[in-house]
């Protein structure tokens, strides 16, 4: 284990209700704007203070968003992903992948292109 970084990858369904200022987060990624090498996925880059996502508390910077209201986010241009969120309606269901760094733990996933730096 020494000299190796391990990650525990989990998935979660997060249901957000759009607040007065929206969902309250930023994203990076897309086929035209890869955030992680060889991965065109959509990642959370900022959680805005007092926004819907921050108040819910589960979505974290660095999370990968796999789907919105059941619609897969694979192979989307960045702006198309942004538009998908903006048009997602009042109740928004997000399928997200959390990636937690673990210190020499027995359970983990060897991470390549780590989005958390």
């Amino acid at each position: 284990m020494n000299g190796r970084v391990d990650y525990l990858v989990t998935e979660e369904e997060i249901n957000l209700t759009r607040g007065p200022s929206g969902l309250g987060f930023n994203i990076v990624g897309g086929t035209d704007q890869q955030y992680v090498s060889n991965d065109s996925g959509i990642y959370v880059s900022r959680i805005k203070e007092n926004g819907a996502a921050a108040l819910d508390g589960r979505l974290q910077e660095g999370d990968k968003i796999l789907s919105v209201n059941g619609q897969d986010l694979k192979n989307l241009l960045h702006q198309d992903a942004v538009d998908l969120f903006r048009n997602a309606g009042y109740a928004v269901s997000l399928r997200v992948q959390h990636r937690l760094q673990v210190q020499n733990g027995p359970i983990g996933h060897r991470g390549e292109g780590d989005p958390s730096g």
Epitope: S21, G22, L23, G24, F25, N26, I27, V28, Y35, V36, Y43, V44, S45, R46, I47, K48, E49, E61, G62, H78, Q79, V82, F85, R86, P115, S116, G117
Partner: nanobody, 128 residues
Amino acid sequence: DVQLVESGGGLVQAGGSLRLSCAASGRPFSSLDMGWFRQRPGKERDVVATINWTGDSTYYLDSVKGRFTISRDNAKNTVFLQMNSLKPEDTAVYYCAARGGGSSVDSEYDVGEFEYYYWGQGTQVTVS
């Protein structure tokens, strides 16, 4: 979390120049909006200059426009503040700051324009 380490501060005569650097680690630098803030003696901390994650949008405090230039080097995970024609009133502790960049999923307008939440320890700039 993001760690920020500033360098380049010091004592300089009025009219002189300094270049501040801020090295970031902890997450991909290219996804971060970066900024320089300063706190002058007995004053609130003010934004001096900011640069967005893509490097194509900058902001400057009116009193530093034309004298200070903010830039970033994504290959080196570093943001710079080139300060020319320094004045005694530029004396302050200068702080590097960061926040997640990216596109808002809500609207083009970004509420809380100077809402930064990762901070360096600061570097002293004294202009005599």
